[in-house]
């Protein structure tokens, strides 16, 4: 979950609560347990979240 | 702010041993993957050793030049990073760099310890 | 290992115009999502500073003039428009696998 007040992260970034900052996506490749990838594979395209809530 | 302060360099002959220091602060060391990256005017930048997490059981990786000779440990208790180097060669002079970084790219640099091996 | 060839080893830019550097890799260091590509700026008497990750990332604080593009093997960094400040020597970088290779640099100066 992303810190309340956060801007939100850019594409191809996520949230990592652990580091309190937006992390690119694409370090999951060599560190597939940090927190924010969760975060990189959910993430639905945005028409999908602008049509469902 | 972020600092990365390598030590420890300094003149030793051909076969000699060295050990270089580097101590951080103002991120969480412990998080980060740690790397030693030397520079030379004969190679350029080149890329020396790693060390990852304590979740990794703090697995090393080296350069094929390298191995065998260079030992990197860390003591996250002190956010310190080490470098071990025995059997220098000349091939071994330059600076040497401690570098921090999450994964891939090389966030923080240190200023560098220049490492000179020469009779 | 893979080896990244930078071009041209030196280049001259007038103040304003655009600086255009090349980095070629001996193998492909992108997935279907991600180059795994990263830029240094290297100034006299400093130590290398990361300014794109990822092929495209802008690090934070870098200014926007500085942009990266490229996937595969072929990777460019531009500077546009050059300012004095970006006099300085710069890397490419690959961590698609162990060991990791830079580039041998390209000089920039600023006519």
């Known amino acids: 979950e992303q810190a309340p007040g956060t801007a939100p992260c850019s594409r191809g970034s996520s949230w990592s609560a652990d580091l309190d900052k937006c992390m690119d996506c694409a370090s999951c490749r060599a560190r597939p347990h940090s927190d924010f990838c969760l975060g990189c594979a959910a993430a639905p395209p945005a028409p999908f979240r602008l049509l469902w809530p | 702010e972020v600092k990365l302060e390598e030590s420890g360099g300094g003149l030793v002959q051909p076969g000699g041993s060295m050990k270089l220091s580097c101590v951080a602060s103002?991120?969480?060391?412990?998080?980060?993957?740690m790397s030693w990256v030397r520079q030379s005017p004969e190679k350029g930048l080149e890329w020396v050793a790693e060390i990852r997490l304590k979740s990794d059981n703090y697995a090393t990786h080296y350069a094929e030049s390298v191995k065998g000779k260079f030992t990197i440990s860390r003591d996250d208790s002190k956010s310190r990073l080490y470098l071990q180097m025995n059997s220098l060669r000349a091939e071994d002079t330059g600076i040497y760099y401690c570098t921090g970084y999450y994964a891939d790219a090389m966030d923080y640099w240190g200023q560098g310890t220049s490492v000179t091996v020469s009779s | 290992d893979i080896v990244l060839t930078q071009s041209p080893a030196s280049l001259a830019v007038s103040l304003g115009q655009r600086a255009t550097i090349s980095c070629r890799a001996s193998?492909?260091?992108?997935?279907?999502?991600?180059?795994?590509m990263h830029w240094y700026q290297q100034k006299p008497g400093q130590p290398p500073k990361l300014l794109i990750k990822?092929?495209?990332n802008l690090e934070s604080g870098v200014p926007a003039r500085f942009s990266g593009s490229g996937s595969g093997t072929d990777f460019t960094l531009n500077i546009h428009p050059v300012e004095e400040e970006d006099t300085a020597t710069y890397y490419c970088q690959h961590s698609w696998e162990i060991p990791y290779t830079f580039g041998g640099g390209t000089k920039l100066e600023i006519k």
């Open positions: 103002g991120f969480t060391f412990s998080s980060y993957w």
């Open positions: 193998q492909s260091v992108s997935t279907s999502s991600y180059s795994y």
């Open positions: 990822y092929a495209s």
